[in-house]
Every structure is written in structure tokens, then in C-alpha cells.
């Protein structure tokens, strides 16, 4: 069961698997959640011990029964991992801790104007896990305003001491706030030299990349595939680092694949969740349980529901045996990866989906789309919202997209003449406008944030954020879409759709059912030729068929231009303007969301 509360003055007895240092019990809980085996923890605050070296210790614990004896101990704080919970989990920790110094390897010292600047420097430094900043009041003159960047092997401090007039905190890479380059390519027939910091077994290069991404020291990796000549190294994932942060040497090696950690990427692809099945493959590890079930999907579900299960192997039933039930072997290991991977065994293996909730919600796979047809089905575009105005009478005003649990991204031009957010209603999870009745629940708008350089749609900056009065609970029919990542600047999107309840032709009315149209992107040069009287800037993106026929139209404004890349949907554009609707050689013009990611993050994370 999910227990989120912390137990003050309680120590959990036994079950120790590791001890780390954390600045707070809350952070200890996050570390426990991300540790492959930790189910419970005990944190020792500064009042709990006479010995300062014991302050801020976070003891990670495991238990077969998922519980441990409780002992009264002043100053101790205990609790449970969030692995048992269904809510989203994030390693992001924006807290700044006053008068604490987190110890690590200090590898960079420089002056900074503020703790925030120091934290940003850490976030944008490939090696930095956490920092300490000496404030203007620090006793030592030469150390005032010094920003120390630090790293450790584990990503957690090697100790935490009280130190007056300093502040300390963590890198915000796990908050998807880094400006570092994000290299998503996986390079075939390539091995990287450089030092190995760890090695694990992985069934493919993408799982290897995900493991690298959430290993604190891994910057890039090399994976030896099943076809690798040296048998003992098959399926071996080597986690690597270097002083520069980049591989020093690329070696051509057949059947090896290499790539980079995605730690600095902004949202966009799942890094914890390994959802694939591996056929004719056995994952070896410590056995938790063996259960007879029907099919490998059922086996994965069983593993996901068993909190200590990390991966599984399903042995299909022999013909007409056991009512078609095969054996489901639930397994675990010290690091969450199989100890060995065997091929050609007839088994079907995979991982728990419990870790999927550590990824950004926007990366979750949605229902397969119905191809063809122009009417959407429920849950097909779960980020699409309908924005209504209640003045003078209630009507659909614009589309919009969920990008966070309190944020809708839409177009600035939608708010022409809108004097107050009080007249706005956001309806989420809606397929048909006819579903909206007097008593239909909606989200009120707390604030409208229009880009301060917006003047009119045709001159750009046609972007706005709506802050909702209450938060959205994500379900299959209402969830966010990923923002594009700076690292995706060179991606060529080929699967793009525009959606909305807008007109189907120039003189029409708002549609009842959410419409969809697959539309190809058009280069800005091509688009500029079609709109000689306008300036098509890099902050705009165009889409449309040369012959016309499919396009966004009145009422679609503010809605998404959604493009699928690497199995994840990205909000590439916001429906903005165009000449007529679906006219020949007049593509639709959309706000290029990629160019506004910093603006969006600045406003939503203020």
C-alpha cells in the first residue's frame, strides 16, 4: 500500500541496504524511491545524535514483508518509498538548504551573484550533482559569493555539515531545466573509449541508454549487442565518463552501439520505463516468486504490482497444458538489471512498469490512433482542451494543450477583447462539444500570461499560457503533451496532426466532434514564398498540402500541431494564422513551440 506520510521520532529496525547523506527526510524519501531495492528508510536529523558525522544520514532499507519493526528514537524520521504509490514521482529537488554544506569532490570554484546563479551553473555543467554557495555574509572575505560545483560517485553527498552563511542545493537536470546539448542519436558499429564507471546487463541499446541516463556518473555508454563476437560480453552495457564530458575516442566496432545519457534533455522521452517485451530471452536474477499466468502481458502486470519485482521471465505453456497458463518468474537484483541475459530459451522477458511513473507523464503511450477518418475518438488526443468564454454567452473560443498539471498552452490572439480570466472555462477530456452542459465540470483560469512581445498573430509571438485554478489529475483521456527539446532542433517530423473543433471550411460553424488532419510540415523558405506580404520568422512553423484541402481553420486557434517522434508526441506548433482555410499553396502558420521552450519554463516555474 502507498504510505506518503513521514513518521517522526521513529526508527525502522534492520533491513539496511545502503547509507547515503541527504539534507532532508523528504529528499531521503526520493532517494529511496529511485533506489532499485529500497522500500523503507530512516533519516537522522541533526538533533538525533551527539555525533555530527551521523547527522543527515539516510539509511535505505528493504524488507520481504515490506515493513520493519518501529523503534522510538528522538530526531529520527522514517518512511516508505513512493514505489508503492501510483502518483508521479520526480527526482527534481529545487530546495535550497540554508547553513548546510553538502560534501563531495569540489571540482570548480567561481564567483556567482546569487545562489540561483550558482544552481543554474551546476545545472548547466555536465559533471555537477550539487553545489554550495557562500553568501555575502560568509566570514571569509575571499570566499564570499564563491560557487562550488561538486560531484560524487553516487550523486549524493559524502557528508553534510552545518556551515553558517552558506546555502547548498542540487542540480536541476532532473527537473529538465538544463541548457546542455542533448544528443539523442545512438551510433551503430561504434564503441567509445574512456573509463567505465559501471557495467550492467541490458537487452538492447535503448535500455542501456536509460540506465546510463539515471546513473549519476554516466555521461555516455557503449552496448555490446547479442551478435557481439565475445560471448561473455554480449548484452553488456558499459557506463562511461570523461573529464570533458564527451568521448575522447570513437572506435569502429561491428555489433557495438554507443550513445549519450539523456540527463540534460528537456522532457520528451521515457528514461525509466522499459516497456518492451524481449522474446526468446531469459533474464536471470534472484527469484521472488513463480506464478502460473496466461500470457506475458499478465506476467508483466504481476511484476508491476509486486513492489519488489524488477524484471520477469515468462515461460509459455506447453501446448494444451495447465489451461494455457505459463510460468511467470518474478525476479530482482541488487541494481535492478538482470545478472545475465540468455537468448534462444523460448522465454519472454521484460521489466516492471512501476518505474514508468518516474517519467514525465507526457511520454506515456496513448491509445493507438484510428487512421483515416477526420473525427477523433476519445483518448486519441488527451492533451487537447476546449477553451470556452462565458461572455456574452458561453461558446467555444479556442483550442489549447495541457503541458503541465496546472498549465494550458494556447495562442495569444485568442484573448483579443478578453478582459478577465474569470470569463474563461477550460474543459478537459472532451470529445464532443455537446457533452458540455451546465453541470459539466471545468477548470477556472487563475491567470492569462501573454507573451509580452505579442502584437498580432501575423507578426509572431502568438503564444499564451493559462494557469488553472486547480490541478489536473491525469487519466487516459486527459494528460499532457511533451514540449519539444532543444536537442530536437534538427529532427524532421514526418507524423504531424492538427486537431480542433474549428470550422471545416471558411464559412462554417464550430464542429461537435474533435476533428483531426494529418498535415506535412513545410520549410520556412517554402512558406515565405507563399506569404510574400508577411515575414515568416524562425519562431513560426508552417504546415499544409500544396493542393490545400486539409488545414486548421477558425476555432482551431491555440490548438496543437502534434508530431510523433520516437513513439512520443511533441507539441511542435500552436495553431496561429493563415490565408483563408485549406487554400491551395497557403499553408497554415503555427507558433514554433521549440523557440519558446525557455519562455514557457520561465513562466511555469517562476
Amino acid at each position: 500500500e502507498c504510505v506518503t506520510r513521514l513518521f517522526k521520532d521513529i526508527h525502522f529496525e534492520g533491513g539496511d541496504i545502503a547509507t547515503v547523506f541527504t539534507p532532508s527526510a523528504k529528499h531521503c524519501q526520493v532517494v529511496c524511491t529511485h533506489h532499485p531495492r529500497c522500500l523503507l528508510f530512516t533519516f537522522t536529523g541533526e538533533s538525533a545524535s551527539e555525533d555530527p558525522t551521523q547527522w543527515f544520514t539516510c539509511v535505505l532499507k528493504d524488507s520481504v514483508t515490506e515493513t520493519l519493526p518501529r523503534v522510538n528514537r528522538t530526531g529520527a524520521i522514517s518512511g516508505y518509498s513512493f514505489k508503492q504509490c501510483s502518483h508521479q514521482i520526480s527526482a527534481c529537488n529545487k530546495d535550497i538548504y540554508v547553513d548546510l554544506n553538502m560534501k563531495g569532490i569540489n571540482y570548480n570554484s567561481s564567483l556567482a551573484e546569487s545562489a540561483q546563479e550558482c544552481q543554474e551553473r551546476c545545472t548547466d555543467d555536465v559533471h555537477c550533482h550539487f553545489f554550495t554557495y557562500a553568501t555575502r555574509q560568509f566570514p571569509s572575505l575571499e570566499h564570499r559569493n564563491i560557487c562550488l560545483l561538486k560531484h560524487t560517485q553516487t550523486g549524493t553527498p559524502t557528508g553534510i555539515m552545518k556551515l553558517d552563511k552558506v546555502v547548498t542545493g542540487f542540480s536541476l537536470k532532473s527537473c529538465a531545466l538544463s541548457n546542455l546539448a542533448c544528443i539523442r542519436d545512438v551510433f551503430p558499429n561504434t564503441a567509445f573509449a574512456d573509463s567505465n564507471i559501471d557495467s550492467v546487463m541490458a537487452p538492447d541499446a535503448f535500455v542501456c541508454r536509460r540506465i546510463c541516463t539515471h546513473h549519476p556518473g554516466c555521461l555516455f555508454f557503449t552496448f555490446f549487442s547479442q551478435e557481439w563476437p565475445k560471448e561473455s560480453q554480449r548484452n553488456l552495457c558499459l557506463l562511461k565518463t570523461s573529464e570533458s564530458g564527451l568521448p575522447s575516442t570513437r572506435i569502429k566496432k561491428s555489433k557495438a552501439l554507443s550513445g549519450f545519457s539523456l540527463q540534460s534533455c528537456r522532457h520528451s522521452i521515457p528514461v525509466f520505463c522499459h516497456s518492451s517485451f524481449y522474446h526468446d530471452t531469459d533474464f536471470l536474477g534472484e527469484e521472488l516468486d513463480i506464478v502460473a499466468v496466461k500470457g506475458h502481458e499478465a506476467c508483466q502486470k504481476l511484476c508491476t504490482n509486486a513492489v519488489r519485482c524488477q524484471f520477469f521471465t515468462y515461460a509459455p505453456a506447453q501446448a494444451s497444458c495447465n489451461e494455457g497458463k505459463g510460468k511467470c518468474y518474478l525476479k530482482l537484483s541488487s541494481n535492478g538489471s538482470p545478472t545475465k541475459i540468455l537468448r534462444g530459451t523460448g522465454g519472454i522477458s521484460g521489466y516492471t512498469l512501476r518505474l514508468c511513473k518516474m517519467d514525465n507523464e507526457c511520454t506515456t503511450k496513448i491509445k493507438p490512433r484510428i487512421v483515416g477518418g477526420t473525427a477523433s475518438v476519445r483518448g486519441e488526443w488527451p492533451w487537447q482542451v476546449t477553451l470556452h468564454t462565458t461572455s456574452p454567452t458561453q461558446r467555444h473560443l479556442c483550442g489549447g494543450s495541457i503541458i503541465g498539471n496546472q498549465w494550458i498552452l494556447t495562442a495569444a490572439h485568442c484573448f483579443y477583447g478578453v478582459e478577465s480570466p474569470k470569463i474563461l472555462r477550460v474543459y478537459i477530456g472532451i470529445l464532443n462539444q455537446s457533452e458540455i452542459k451546465e453541470d459539466t465540470s471545468f477548470f477556472g483560469v487563475q491567470e492569462i500570461i501573454i507573451h509580452d512581445q505579442y502584437k498580432m498573430a501575423e507578426s509572431g509571438y502568438d503564444i499564451a499560457l493559462l494557469k488553472l485554478e486547480t490541478t489536473v489529475n491525469y487519466t487516459d483521456s486527459q494528460r499532457p503533451i511533451c514540449l519539444p527539446s532543444k536537442g530536437d532542433r534538427n529532427v524532421i517530423y514526418t507524423d504531424c496532426w492538427v486537431t480542433g473543433w474549428g470550422y471545416r471550411k471558411l464559412r462554417d460553424k464550430i464542429q461537435n466532434t474533435l476533428q483531426k488532419a494529418k498535415i506535412p510540415l513545410v520549410t520556412n523558405d517554402e512558406c515565405q514564398k507563399r506569404y510574400r506580404g508577411h515575414k515568416i520568422t524562425h519562431k513560426m512553423i508552417c504546415a499544409g498540402y500544396r493542393e490545400g484541402g486539409k488545414d486548421a481553420c477558425k476555432g482551431d486557434s491555440g490548438g496543437p500541431l502534434s508530431c510523433k517522434h520516437n513513439e512520443v508526441w511533441h507539441l511542435v506548433g500552436i495553431t496561429s494564422w493563415g490565408e483563408g482555410c485549406a487554400q491551395r499553396e497557403r499553408p497554415g502558420v503555427y507558433t514554433n513551440v521549440l523557440e519558446y521552450v525557455d519562455w514557457i519554463l520561465e513562466k511555469t516555474q517562476a
Epitope: S109, S110, L111, T132, P139, S140, L141, E142
Partner: antibody, heavy 124, light 107 residues
């Protein structure tokens, strides 16, 4: 062992400039600040300024502002102090001195290693 | 700037005797004070930092005390090699400033 070796004595005419070097060895050059202090004949010590060899940031005493420039070359672990528009009262022994260890935060420190000094004579 | 005043300007002491040197700051420098020893023709040498902490290799006969604006350097039993000029220096605010020095000479 840790040492700072300064360049040799200089004789300059008024209005000229002088550039004194200070080569560090035996420690990580970029991890400590470096101060420049001068001492006129028979006088006390006078602080001129400081440089952080890691980032190259500097802070100068108001008296020398506009006339002094402190630089560093991390490849040779050397700091330089250039004083321009020299006048006779700039005749002094110029010292470089190692300051705080900047890779760790602690409250108190002093200038723990000094160069041998460079005599600069300004005379027409 | 913070003005550092040392007294006396000259102190005549016999070997084996105790010497007490004083340093006053024009405003509080907390414990951000260092003491140096300088012999003729040589560079200064750090004795004490943080008002009372002896630098590496400095004999125990040297001790520092005080905080705020009043500081003292004590040499418990003067040795022949201790006859020199002693400077105090504040590290509390830019610009760093030195006292005028106290010359300890043989009585």
C-alpha cells in the same frame, strides 16, 4: 615543495610600465587566489589587489585602480602584475602571495606562501 | 577602508622574556585577522590567521587572541630568531589593510 618564484629586479623611467611575473609550483595553481603586496623602502606592507587564477576575476585597491592590471596564464601557472604610469613613489619591493584555497569553504586564512620579491626602481 | 593601528611601534625585549603586541581595527573585523613576521631582506611569513590559529610550522610560543577591534600577538619566550617586524592584517573587507608594524628588538 610549494613556492612562488618572481621575475628579476627592474629599473624604469617615470611614466613607463612594469610587468612583474610570479610563477607558482608545488600546488594546484587555479585552486588558490593570488595577492600582490608592495613595500616601499623602510615602509610597511601595502595591499595592491587580488586575482582568482581559476576564472581570472580581479579586485584592486582603490589607490591603484586604473593603473594596475593583474592577469594569469594557467598553462604556465604564472600570474602577472602590470603597473603603468610609474612615478618615483612606486619604487618598492613587489611581492606575490598565495591567498585562500578556493576549492573549499572555510572561515579564516592568511597569505601563507610569499614570493621572494621583485625590486622595482623608478628613476629618471 | 579599515585602518589598522599597531602599538607600540618598537618593543625592546630581552631574550626569554614575554612580548605582547597590540593591533586595533577602526571597525570590527570579527576574527578575520592575520599576523606576519618579517625579517630584513626577506618576505613576510604567516604566523597566525583567524586571530588565534597558528599557521603550519609556527612554534607554540606564538599565540594570538582577540576579536572585533582589539587583537594581541603574544610571544611567550623570545628567542633570538624572533627579533623582527610584526604586521597585523585584516581580511574582513576590501581593500585588505595592514598595520604599520611593530619592531621587536633586543633590549
Amino acid at each position: 615543495q610549494v613556492q612562488l618564484v618572481q621575475s628579476g629586479a627592474e629599473v624604469k623611467k617615470p611614466g613607463a610600465s612594469v610587468k612583474v611575473s610570479c610563477k607558482a609550483s608545488g600546488y594546484t595553481f587555479t585552486s588558490y587566489s593570488m595577492h600582490w603586496v608592495r613595500q616601499a623602502p623602510g615602509q610597511g606592507l601595502e595591499w595592491m589587489g587580488i586575482i582568482n587564477p581559476s576564472g581570472g576575476s580581479t579586485s584592486y585597491a582603490q589607490k591603484f585602480q586604473g593603473r594596475v592590471t593583474m592577469t594569469r596564464d594557467t598553462s604556465t601557472s604564472t600570474v602577472y602584475m602590470e603597473l603603468s604610469s610609474l612615478r618615483s613613489e612606486d619604487t618598492a619591493v613587489y611581492y606575490c602571495a598565495r591567498g585562500a584555497y578556493l576549492m573549499e569553504l572555510y572561515y579564516y586564512y592568511g597569505m601563507d606562501v610569499w614570493g621572494q620579491g621583485t625590486t622595482v626602481t623608478v628613476s629618471s | 577602508e579599515i585602518v589598522m593601528t599597531q602599538s607600540p611601534a618598537t618593543l625592546s625585549v630581552s631574550p626569554g622574556e614575554r612580548a605582547t603586541l597590540s593591533c586595533r581595527a577602526s571597525q570590527s573585523v570579527s576574527s578575520n585577522l592575520a599576523w606576519y613576521q618579517q625579517k630584513p631582506g626577506q618576505a613576510p611569513r604567516l604566523l597566525i590567521y583567524g586571530a588565534s590559529t597558528r599557521a603550519t610550522g609556527i612554534p607554540a610560543r606564538f599565540s594570538g587572541s582577540g576579536s572585533g577591534t582589539e587583537f594581541t600577538l603574544t610571544i611567550s619566550s623570545l628567542q633570538s630568531e624572533d627579533f623582527a617586524v610584526y604586521y597585523c592584517q585584516q581580511f574582513n573587507d576590501w581593500p585588505l589593510t595592514f598595520g604599520g608594524g611593530t619592531k621587536v628588538e633586543i633590549k
